[in-house]
């Protein structure tokens, strides 16, 4: 796995009472910021659960893995990690659970080696379209990001500023085509109702996509065709009713794909016939024997793989003149 190891040895801890004295001087190259733990051997800095309100300015130049989790950062401004000399080796940055509600344009600029970014569990009411691309150019310099973890970043309903949350996130993913090299994207638990149709086509390097625990009802307008390298697609715990022929064919055409579909409210009527036929033949779906019907009531808990065409009927729609009030 490519995740940074957090089991760093020989951590040195910086005493809080030194903070004011140290910050008044030019930062020493290998000092450890107040309220953080540092291991030069593991190239790791941990500033965890310290209620920090801003990113420490005196991060050591050697840092490769930076954990800033469980803080109260609120806002990540442009150049939040820009330093002289730059943090040239920073490869993995974890900002999860730090009460971020705003990430501004260029927040991650000047991090040439940043491969993995985790912003999970922050109520991101304002994610700039240029948070990851750094500029508003139509084609930006490629971002070095390979893994982007954005699980549970949906803010409370009253903080969503009357705009589509899905749209805001997708705008940041697509700006300047900067994330063409992205290989893992996690967007679980974000109350997504839909996936904008152009998002996947512009992320051609994806190997792993996690959309689990959202509220996706349909994939009808989503194209997977260009995702040649996609290996895992997590769609568990959504609101999917049926997958239609176009989607089934596209998924079947991806050479390495494995799809996870557990815990969706499948509607087992006549529109489900193609999907059932496909499920019986495909090796794409993991745990396909666990998929069960949710509707109509008479079909509840029936296993999809055990259905045949006679089971899958639709109630006739009566012409208006025959409908009763």
């Amino acid at each position: 796995s490519s995740s940074p190891t957090s089991s760093a040895s020989s951590f040195s801890s910086s005493a809080p009472f030194l903070a004011s004295a140290v910050s008044a001087q030019p930062p020493l190259p290998d000092q450890c910021p107040a309220l953080c733990e540092c291991s030069e051997a593991a190239r790791t800095v941990k500033c965890v659960n310290r209620n920090l309100t801003e990113v420490p300015t005196d991060l050591p130049a050697y840092v490769r893995n930076l954990f800033l989790t469980g803080n109260q950062l609120a806002v990540l401004p442009a150049g939040a990690f820009a330093r002289r000399p730059p943090l040239a080796e920073l490869a993995a940055l974890n900002l999860s659970g730090s009460r971020l509600d705003e990430v501004r344009a260029g927040a991650f600029e000047h991090l040439p080696s940043l491969r993995q970014l985790d912003l999970s569990h922050n109520p991101l009411a304002d994610l700039s379209p240029f948070a990851f691309s750094g500029s508003n150019a139509s084609v930006s310099a490629p971002s070095p990001l390979v893994e982007l973890i954005l699980n549970h970043i949906v803010p409370p309903e009253d903080e969503r500023q009357n705009r589509s949350f899905e749209g805001m996130v997708v705008a940041a993913l697509l700006a300047g085509r900067a994330l063409q090299g992205l290989r893992r994207l996690e967007l679980a638990s974000n109350h997504f109702l839909y996936l904008p149709r152009d998002v996947l086509a512009q992320l051609p390097s994806l190997r792993h996509l996690d959309l689990s625990n959202n509220s996706l009802v349909s994939l009808t307008y989503v194209s997977f065709r260009n995702l040649t390298h996609l290996e895992s697609l997590h769609l568990e715990d959504n609101a999917l009713k049926v997958l239609h022929n176009g989607t089934l064919a596209e998924l079947q055409g991806l050479p390495h794909i494995r799809v996870f579909l557990d815990n969706n409210p499948w509607v087992c009527d006549c529109h489900m016939a193609d999907m059932v036929t496909w499920l019986k033949e495909t090796e794409v779906v993991q745990g396909k024997d666990r998929l069960t019907c949710a509707y109509p009531e008479k079909m509840r808990n029936r296993v999809l793989l055990e259905l045949n065409s006679a089971d899958l009927d639709c109630d006739p729609i009566l012409p208006p003149s025959l409908q009763t009030s």
Partner: antibody
Framework: EVQLLESGGSLVLPGGSLRLSCAAS????????MSWVRQAPGKGLEWVSI???????YYASWAKGRFTISRDNSKNTLYMQMNSLRAEDTALYFC????????????WGQGTLVTVSS | EIVLTQSPSSLSASVGDRVTITCQSS????????LSWYQQKPGKAPKLLIY???TLASGVPSRFSGSGSGTDFTLTISSLQPEDFATYYC?????????????FGQGTKLEIK
């Protein structure tokens, strides 16, 4: 502990067949791409074959038709069936795990020796 | 057939020296970055040092570094330590319509001067 353990290497006659095994422990084989790499005595590393998570297989051009990579997820084991063996197939055969994000071999077994000789 | 050419094939150096090994690919590696470096000692399996051209593998000392893109790559050891004398291999990953292909360089043997 996460590790790979190869077995099945032996002395075999030219034209003969052999099946190598690689038992994985500490992780689920089905979640990773897995590969075979070989090294002739005193020589460098040479890629042989790779199997993707869902079972797609790819081979070095010289291995196509003679070697077959497969796996049994229930046994957490990778295999390499080698047919029509030649003297130049004599080598130490390593199995290796591929990173889930990058296309690199991040875990190696210790190898099993195949000797093809009359 | 894709070829990875390492140079030099062998070199002698002393503890404390700065050493550079180059690797040239006959085709661009996948995404211009999918090149790895491995260290192998006699009788042992290879050990991953650097992946994605420049990312240090977990537990690898920072005296090792990698650079390059596309077809030309470099492994640098900033200050040789006694345990660094070994053989080094580059490995590229390639993708085409027909699928995946992997290749290794012929190796560079680093010996004590």
């Amino acid at each position: 502990e996460v590790q790979l353990l190869e077995s099945g290497g032996s002395l075999v006659l030219p034209g003969g067949s052999l099946r190598l095994s690689c038992a994985a422990s500490g992780f689920s084989l089905s979640s990773y791409w897995m590969s075979w790499v070989r090294q002739a005595p005193g020589k460098g590393l040479e890629w042989v074959s790779i199997i993707a998570g869902r079972g797609s297989t790819y081979y070095a051009s010289w291995a196509k038709g003679r070697f077959t990579i497969s796996r049994d997820n229930s046994k957490n084991t990778l295999y390499m069936q080698m047919n029509s063996l030649r003297a130049e197939d004599t080598a130490l055969y390593f199995c290796a795990r591929v990173s889930s994000i990058y296309y690199t071999f991040n875990l190696w077994g210790q190898g099993t020796l195949v000797t093809v000789s009359s | 057939e894709i070829v990875l050419t390492q140079s030099p094939s062998s070199l002698s150096a002393s503890v404390g020296d700065r050493v550079t090994i180059t690797c040239q690919s006959s085709q661009s590696v996948y995404s211009n970055n999918e090149l790895s470096w491995y260290q192998q000692k006699p009788g042992k399996a290879p050990k991953l040092l650097i992946y994605y051209a420049s990312t240090l593998a977990s537990g690898v000392p920072s005296r090792f570094s990698g650079s390059g893109s596309g077809t030309d790559f470099t492994l640098t050891i900033s200050s040789l330590q006694p345990e660094d004398f070994a053989t080094y291999y580059c490995q590229g990953s390639y993708y085409s319509g027909s699928g995946w292909y992997y290749a290794f360089g012929q190796g560079t043997k680093l010996e004590i001067k």
